[in-house]
């Protein structure tokens, strides 16, 4: 198995400070998943990223940066329709134990008011492995540009594994994709959050196997209702 590119998979370091809503969910000091800051008290991530307790890294593109904010979180709320069998509705809200301090490096993500169409160029980011199947974890946040793929085209690859709240993205004949450790992280299109990294084939970065994301535009009501309910 050849090395699969040298970033996220086949990406590059993000422009510094360009993803101020990006967070890392840590288990102790170890990367567990990505996520996004929705507001001062809430992080959105994938339901399959659930743990008993989280340490949330915010405010720096570099894991281990002493200037970063690190906030504990012990409450998380999975979407009630999440299935550990089909992985449908793969999203979860994590409530921070204390408020995040907003700054130029810590900002709220913009939730979508509409679903972006196939062909839209988007950016997926994370601190996940840059090689697969052998892992190489970067300390700096990585980015890669991908395009939204229509459900019809994605179903040709994944058949009935694809549910209607799943979103596919990739570049034909390219390795560009997310991988282990990127789960729950953002797919941002035209400045709004359209996807959360959910799953894909393995090893990561197989050409013509798109990444699969939770389609956030289908869940804005649940996100807002859940944050309100658990204020």
């Amino acid at each position: 198995e050849e090395a699969q590119g040298d970033k996220i998979i086949d990406g590059a370091p993000c422009a510094r400070g360009s993803h101020p809503w990006q967070v890392a969910l840590l288990s102790g000091n170890q990367l567990h998943c990505g996520g996004v800051l929705v507001n001062e008290r809430w992080v959105l991530t994938a339901a399959h990223c659930k743990m008993n307790e989280y340490t949330v890294h915010l405010g720096s593109d570099t894991l281990g940066d002493r200037r970063a904010q690190r906030i504990k979180a012990s409450k998380s709320f999975r979407h009630p329709g999440y299935s550990t069998q089909t992985h449908v509705n793969d999203l979860m809200l994590v409530k921070l134990n204390s408020q995040a301090r907003l700054s130029s490096m810590v900002k709220k993500v913009r939730l979508p008011s509409r679903c972006e169409p196939p062909g839209t160029t988007c950016t997926v980011s994370g601190w996940g492995t840059t090689t697969s199947p052998d892992v190489t974890f970067p300390s700096d946040l990585m980015c890669v540009d991908v395009k939204l793929i229509s459900p019809q085209d994605c179903t040709k690859v994944y058949k009935d594994l694809l549910e209607n709240s799943m979103l596919c993205a990739g570049i034909p004949d390219s390795k560009k994709n997310a991988c282990n450790g990127d789960s729950g992280g953002p797919l941002v299109c035209r400045g709004t959050l359209q996807g959360l990294v959910s799953w894909g084939t393995f090893p990561c970065g197989q050409p013509n196997d798109p990444g699969v994301y939770t389609q956030v535009c289908k869940f804005t009501k649940w996100i807002n209702d859940t944050m309100k309910k658990h204020r």
Epitope: K50, L161, T201, C204
Partner: antibody, heavy 122, light 108 residues
Framework: QVQLVQSGAEVKKPGASVKVSCKAS????????IHWVRQAPGQGLEWMGS????????NYAQKLQGRVTMTTDTSTSTAYMELRSLRSDDTAVYYC???????????????WGQGTMVTVSS | DIQMTQSPSSLSASVGDRVTITCRAS??????LNWYQQKPGKAPKLLIY???SLQSGVPSRFSGSGSGTDFTLTISSLQPEDFATYYC??????????FGGGTKVEIK
């Protein structure tokens, strides 16, 4: 070294319970799922169920539902499989296996424990 | 549940022979099929994943093909260390993960 090391052989009486352990080393235990597969003497492989090391989510084979419990201890990177109300046809080698994949979905077993022989006999 | 049917259940072959084992799924599993080798008293070992991708460290005489419902494992030139039992499994529609019944490759 990346490996799964299982506990030793067990002999149990019908109606008893057995708990088999599987200790992971050389990789981040919480990033992967652990599955249990058994093999009766001279027979094929039978999937028993799986557990996510981080979330504790479990999926069990229908025929074992109610008799099997899978757990993990992340502080020691150990997975456990307990089987209750043992019968003679539970006599088998029990394997733990790591499923490879990324995100919510996994695709194949890339690492196996050495197996634990469980004999159920009166 | 998806049923996996392997054939033959056993075969006799000589060193240097080309050996073919088939696995049939009861419904389409795309290319999400894997092959494992198991020797007596040992745990299974992954040979092929995703129907045709060779696992790292596995000799190139092993190859896999197929998609949908019909899959094949081929050993191009059987070596003494290849005498073992071979299993397929599917990770497409899970749970449960289902295995084929196994094919025992014996010395002629």
């Amino acid at each position: 070294q990346v490996q799964l090391v299982q506990s030793g052989a067990e002999v149990k009486k019908p109606g008893a319970s057995v708990k088999v352990s599987c200790k992971a080393s050389g990789y981040t235990f919480t990033s992967e799922g652990i599955h249990w597969v058994r093999q009766a003497p001279g027979q094929g492989l039978e999937w028993m169920g799986s557990i996510s090391a981080s979330s504790g989510d479990t999926n069990y084979a229908q025929k074992l539902q109610g008799r099997v419990t899978m757990t993990t201890d992340t502080s020691t990177s150990t997975a456990y499989m307990e089987l209750r109300s043992l019968r003679s046809d539970d006599t088998a080698v029990y394997y733990c296996a790591r499923a490879a994949g990324y995100g919510a979905r996994h695709w194949y077993f890339d690492l196996w424990g050495q197996g634990t022989m469980v004999t159920v006999s009166s | 549940d998806i049923q996996m049917t392997q054939s033959p259940s056993s075969l006799s072959a000589s060193v240097g022979d080309r050996v073919t084992i088939t696995c049939r799924a009861s419904q389409s599993i795309s290319s999400y099929l894997n092959w494992y080798q198991q020797k007596p008293g040992k745990a299974p070992k992954l040979l092929i994943y995703g129907a045709s991708s060779l696992q790292s460290g596995v000799p190139s005489r092993f190859s896999g093909s197929g998609s949908g419902t019909d899959f094949t494992l081929t050993i191009s030139s059987l070596q003494p260390e290849d005498f073992a039992t071979y299993y397929c499994d599917q990770f497409y529609s899970t749970p449960p993960i289902t295995f084929g019944g196994g094919t025992k490759v014996e010395i002629k």
